[in-house]
Interface confidence: low
């Protein structure tokens, strides 16, 4: 009913709550002397469904049969219309359309932890659209029954607030849920279980790890569990991995030895528990324990390479380079590298520990046979030393690889190819491809890169430390016993025309010809490997085409003679540089007049 209904009544039959698809009769009747003021037959009763007029009748009452009402609540209002006045609201009613509850399905109960309380969940089935009450009943041994009601509109969970104890773990309990509304009731199938079936242990806590004698091979994981736990499963993985290692253990009593951990690796560990081999469910995973395993002595050997540089008649500079061990080989933080330099015939040796670098330079006599050994040390020990005999890597001309080429291969890669040396190719034990940024003046501080290639390979893709628009000096070494041969080439991964031309810094006259000297183009403006320089000249005030002389690029060259200038004529000279992509803009212009006599 709505409003006070002082003027009349609205009745609904058979009920205000009906099953979907049912028909209802709605009657609106006026109370005595509540009609229109003058003439009661002028009474016009109108029935509204929400705001839409669905029926009307002149007189003291109105009957209406209504079908097809939708699920949910529908509001009907009866109004009186008299001549020359507004409609007056008489009374109204709400009709609730719904369905009887379906049988609740998949009833399941759980108790979280031995000290937890029993809670059950179920699937309600389709919405009844009516107020529906759920009653959960749990019956156990000794005729004990617990009951709890839920009046929430969407009820599919109830916590009994009681704790099942393990005194008789095999005792049966039965749970049942019943749904009731105005249109009917329905009960779930009973769910029967024991203590062991429904208790889900709390996840293990207080997880710790111990490494006996700081060794990764003697590692024990400890944790605490609820008292009745019989089974555990452990999962662990390196922190940077997505894949877990899994171990199942029985009667672990809060400890387990792990035998396959890698040294110097941060691991994540989690543990789950269960009360019975085949009853009940696993606990949630414990909170993660993160721990780093101890170091072990390095395995593997360093990849070592070297460069020799002539200083004077009696001395040479040796620069040693080596690559870091991989994480799995280093097995700890590398504290230092140990370099031993030995003269093989005289037996003199010197050892040095190097920290923070992967290179070492020293000066040794040019005489004698020298060897080096390099190893990496962490807190637990050293790797096996890599031994190298220092030799003239390019001395054996017959071992020099042939037809070396270097071509751009995609973004920041260079493909180096070669042909085996003329001398018996089967004598080659390995090739080494070495590359470094080309710096005029042969700067020895420029980082050196190298890779090793098997003797049957005739190509290598170099990509490490390769930058676009930089020229690299690439050498291919063929090594055979204590001999080596090499060939070199310049290469770049990407090139374009140089950004500027060489800067002419001097023009000098020598015996009727001139010598032009220039400064190298800064490396960052070369935009790849230079192929040629061009020297242009023309008479100062002439409109004729300039003459030019093209000279191949050589790293160390920065002067060139020209002998075709006429005496006592003023010339303008300038230079450009070329890569495979094109020619630079002009460098600076210089004027010059040859003073010598005409031939």
């Amino acid at each position: 009913k709505i409003d006070a209904c002082k003027r009349g009544d609205v009745t609904v039959k058979p009920s205000h709550v009906i099953l979907l698809g049912s028909t209802v009769n709605i009657t609106c009747s006026l109370k005595p002397r509540q009609g229109c003021f003058h003439y009661s037959r002028r009474n016009k009763l109108i029935l509204y469904k929400f705001d839409r007029r669905i029926n009307f009748h002149h007189g003291h009452s109105l009957n209406s049969q209504v079908t097809g009402l939708p699920l949910g609540t529908t509001l009907f209002v009866c109004k009186l219309a008299c001549i020359n006045s507004d409609e007056i609201q008489i009374c109204g009613a709400e009709i609730f359309v719904g369905v009887a509850p379906e049988q609740p399905q998949n009833l399941s109960c759980i108790q979280k932890g031995e000290q937890g309380t029993v809670a059950c969940t179920w699937e309600r089935g389709r919405d009844t659209h009516l107020y529906t009450e759920y009653t959960l009943q749990l019956s156990g041994p000794k005729n004990l029954t617990w009951q709890k009601q839920c009046k929430d509109i969407y009820c599919d969970y109830l916590d009994f607030g009681i704790n099942l104890t393990p005194e008789s773990p095999e005792s049966n309990f039965t749970a049942k849920v019943t749904a009731v509304n105005s249109l009917g009731s329905s009960s779930s199938l009973p769910s029967t279980f024991t203590f062991l079936d429904i208790v889900r242990p709390l996840p293990p806590w207080d997880i710790r790890i111990k490494f006996q004698k700081a060794s990764v091979s003697r590692c024990t994981l400890y944790w605490r569990d609820e008292g009745l736990v019989l089974l555990n499963r452990l999962r662990y993985r390196p922190s940077n991995s997505r894949l877990w290692n899994m171990v199942n253990v029985t009667k672990a009593k809060g400890r387990h030895d792990l035998l396959d951990l890698k040294p110097f690796t941060e691991y994540e560990f989690q543990i789950s528990s269960k009360l019975h081999l085949y009853k009940g469910s696993w606990s949630d995973w414990s909170e993660s324990l993160r721990a780093q395993t101890p170091e072990e002595e390095p395995t593997g050997m360093l990849d070592v390479w070297y460069m020799k540089r002539h200083i004077d008649y009696s001395r040479q500079q040796i620069s040693l380079f080596w690559k870091n061990l991989s994480v799995s080989e280093a097995r700890g933080k590398i504290l230092h590298y140990q370099v031993t330099l030995q003269e093989l015939t005289g037996g003199k040796a010197m050892t040095q520990n190097i920290t923070g670098h992967t290179s070492w330079t020293t000066v040794i006599p040019r005489t004698g046979n020298w060897a080096v050994a390099v190893s990496a040390a962490n807190s637990k020990g050293s790797s096996l030393p890599t031994r190298i005999n220092i030799m003239n890597l390019c001395e054996a001309g017959l071992l020099a690889p042939r037809q070396v080429s270097a071509n751009s291969e995609g973004m920041d890669n260079i493909l180096v190819t070669w042909q085996p040396p003329r001398k018996d190719p089967s004598a080659v034990q390995e090739y080494v491809v070495e590359w470094r940024e080309l710096h005029p003046g042969g700067d020895t501080q420029v980082p050196l890169n190298w890779l090793r290639s098997r003797p049957y390979n005739v190509s290598a893709l170099i990509s490490e430390n390769i930058k676009s628009y930089i020229c690299y000096e690439i050498r291919v070494y063929a090594l055979s016993g204590d001999q080596g041969g090499c060939s070199s080439i310049l290469g770049n991964s990407k090139h374009k025309a140089p950004l500027s031309g060489p800067h002419i810094n001097a023009i000098t006259e020598e015996k009727g010809s001139i010598l032009i000297s220039w400064n190298s183009i800064p490396v960052q403006e070369q935009m790849g490997c230079l192929l040629h320089y061009r020297i242009y000249w023309k008479e100062r005030d002439s409109n004729s085409q300039p003459q030019l002389c093209e000279i191949p690029y050589r790293v160390s060259q920065n002067s060139h003679p020209i002998n075709s200038l006429q005496p006592r004529v003023t010339y303008v000279l300038w230079m450009t540089a070329l890569t495979a992509a094109g020619e630079s803009s002009h460098g600076n212009e210089r004027e010059f007049c040859l003073q010598g006599k005409a031939n």
Epitope: E268, E287, S288, L289, R290
Partner: nanobody, 129 residues
Framework: QVQLQESGGGLVQPGGSLRLSCAAS????????MAWFRQAPGTEREFVAG?????????FYDNSVMGRFTISRDSAKNTMWLQINNLKPEDTAVYYC?????????????????????WGQGTQVTVSS
Amino acid sequence: QVQLQESGGGLVQPGGSLRLSCAASGRTFSNYAMAWFRQAPGTEREFVAGLSGSGGDTAFYDNSVMGRFTISRDSAKNTMWLQINNLKPEDTAVYYCAAATHVVVSYGLVRRRGTYDYWGQGTQVTVSS
């Protein structure tokens, strides 16, 4: 840029209560670890309470405050709170809010200052009669 702003500190008598707030702006931290630290004069900054940031937000507490302090957050408002009850004189300190840009599910890591990428300026809590 990211900013964390603490508020709610003040002078309170022993046994009293306070609710500290930390409002984050500049990015959303709803899925990431956040924590409260405190620093008394002449001591190191110490961990008080933290939220893991993983699904379901595990709460971590230092033993000295367990049961008296409650950490919570409202992801929609990008705000974190620390409810402090039964205050003691030894709770006197500057309280700092900290936020990480990752989930932290290890008790060892949640306590480390280095775990957190952003810090607030702090709010003073003084407990005195």
